[in-house]
Interface confidence: low
């Protein structure tokens, strides 16, 4: 079957839209009237209250939309709505760093139904966004390359559909944990893929299989750059007990949403934080997350590391290839940004069994203490570890070393760090030295060699 609409054209239930393994049921999308796609415009001039706009000259001219700015569309996913706080929060953070037309796309008329139907309704949403982009181009000469579409879950595939319909001329699409069911393993026509925009970046946060794990997000790479924070499956802070999950710092409603789909929602929270942390989400090219956690992918290569989230488009190699995979760790609550360091400690003093910790002090801030090694501490041995600091310490000025005994030792041995090398993710090294040794639980300050 096929159904046609005056503005948006025709929609069929033929393969690959239906009747394939991933979507066996022949279902058509609802009508544009029923999906009721709305465009809610926030700008730097109206950051708190949206203006509802339409693909119409008088509507745009009568709004705060400015043609000399970039336009970022944000599309929500299944069951969600365009007035939800998270979309406006993305806009508000954008206004801290740029002048922009920020359009939250509401399609709750089509998202609050069964999942299979909603997965078809995104075709209408994508067509509506494409129509809007093409209208801006024809009416105002506004280039699609100045458009960025950000989509969460099903919204990521709606963004892909908008990009496909505008022949890949949209400047950028960001997929925030694109939905897995009915999309993973489907032909590119159906789902978000790198041909949908000049640049497609993706954040995967809930990549466990839908059966039996209820992972809503895709594990499949679908962009030019695909980021897998914390491995892309289980996000830190999402394994809280039910009560603490629901009684969330952001309120009961956000806590309830988190309880239902914490990993899946983390993607937009990371993106929101990335806007105000231009270097806090460096993604490391790596074979897998296991290799990354084994400390085999540090520092960034000579071409640099892309930033997951808002600043991914600054990566020089962003469109060198498709399916480039990057790994990183984040925090367990906002602020999610982290800065990775490698610390190598050369020991001095007595041979003991214990563990050593180091804290960093720089011109931008100071870190907590991080464990570098646990085991036999032998003089002249060197131990290295990588850790993710919640503070960007900047240029290192000094480090502090402390050690703890694993067993009671009546001889009160002294241990020191003759040299500590700190390496930042861009490969910049800072060397610190001290001839001193200290008893356990005593801080030793090392200064530049």
């Amino acid at each position: 079957k096929e159904v046609c609409y005056e503005r948006l054209g025709c929609f069929s239930d033929d393969s690959p839209w239906s009747g394939i393994t991933e979507r066996p049921l022949h279902i058509l999308p609802w009508s544009p009237k029923d999906v009721n796609t709305r465009f809610l415009l926030y700008t730097n001039e109206n950051p708190n209250n949206f203006q509802e706009v339409a693909a119409d000259s008088s509507s745009i001219s009568g709004s705060n939309f400015k043609t000399n700015r970039k336009t970022r569309f944000i599309i929500h996913g299944f069951i969600d709505k365009g007035e939800e706080n998270w979309l406006a929060n993305v806009c508000k953070n954008l206004f801290k760093v740029e002048s922009v037309n920020c359009i939250c796309v509401d399609w709750k008329g089509g998202s609050r139904t069964g999942y299979t139907q909603a997965s078809q309704n995104i075709r209408i949403v994508g067509a509506e966004v494409a129509y809007f982009v093409e209208f801006l181009q024809s009416a105002f000469g506004y280039s699609p390359s100045n458009v960025h579409v950000i989509g969460h879950s099903l919204g990521a595939h709606a963004a892909g559909e908008a990009g496909r319909r505008t022949n890949g001329t949209i400047g950028r699409i960001t997929g925030l944990d694109p939905a897995e069911p009915c999309f993973q393993g489907t032909p590119e026509l159906v789902r978000l893929d790198p041909s949908d925009a000049k640049f497609v970046d993706v954040i995967h946060t809930d990549g466990a299989p839908i059966v039996p794990n209820l992972g809503f997000g895709m594990s499949q790479v679908v962009g030019h750059l695909d980021f897998f924070p914390n491995g892309g499956v289980e996000m830190p802070g999402c394994k809280k007990n039910i009560l603490s999950q629901i009684v969330d710092i952001d309120g009961i409603w956000e806590g309830t949403r988190d309880f239902a789909a914490c990993n899946h929602l983390r993607s937009y929270k990371y993106y929101t934080d990335s806007i105000v942390n231009p270097d806090g989400f460096a993604g490391f090219p790596c074979a897998s997350y296991n290799v990354f956690t084994a400390n085999k992918c540090f520092p960034c290569p000579s071409g640099g590391c892309p930033q997951m989230g808002h600043y991914a488009d600054r990566y020089p190699g962003k469109t060198n290839d498709v399916g480039q995979k990057f790994y990183l760790d984040t925090g367990d609550a906002s602020n999610f940004a982290r800065w990775r360091y490698k610390v190598s400690v050369t020991l001095s003093g007595k041979k003991v069994t214990g563990h050593i910790l180091v804290s960093l002090f720089g011109n931008k801030g100071n870190s907590k203490q991080y464990e570098i090694f646990k085991g036999t501490l032998k003089p002249d041995s060197t131990h290295s570890n990588e850790f993710d600091s919640d503070v960007d310490v900047g240029d290192l000025q000094m480090v502090k070393f402390i050690w703890y005994n694993n067993v009671i030792n009546p001889t009160l041995p002294r241990v020191g760090a003759s040299k500590i090398i700190v390496e930042t993710n861009v490969g910049k090294q800072f060397n610190f030295c001290s001839p001193e040794t200290v008893r356990e639980e005593v801080l030793l300050t090392l200064t530049p060699c």
Partner: nanobody, 121 residues
Framework: QVQLQESGGGLVQAGGSLRLSCAAS????????MGWYRQTPGTERDVVAT???????NYADSVKGRFTISRDNILNTVYLQMNSLKPEDTAVYHC???????????????WGQGTLVTVSS
Amino acid sequence: QVQLQESGGGLVQAGGSLRLSCAASGSIGSIHTMGWYRQTPGTERDVVATIQDGGSTNYADSVKGRFTISRDNILNTVYLQMNSLKPEDTAVYHCNADVRPYRTSRYLELWGQGTLVTVSS
């Protein structure tokens, strides 16, 4: 008010050289990444080169070996030395910087107005 001001653009023959400068002025706490982007009519703004506060540099493939980015952290200035220029390098070159204004905790993304570089064949 923190702002960026570019200079150094102009007309040059293919094979020639130009040096662009971009100075950040105002009440600056610190500057993280600085960079140069270029744009031709009807296209998106593309990264040319970036340099982080630690000195780490990145270049677009099309300019590697020909362009050199550098910065002076005392003068809060970034430079782009462009050698062996080609007609396809013709564009408006925009300076970009992540600037944290004095006594604030957030970095702001700032753009310069742009300077036109024309390479004639």
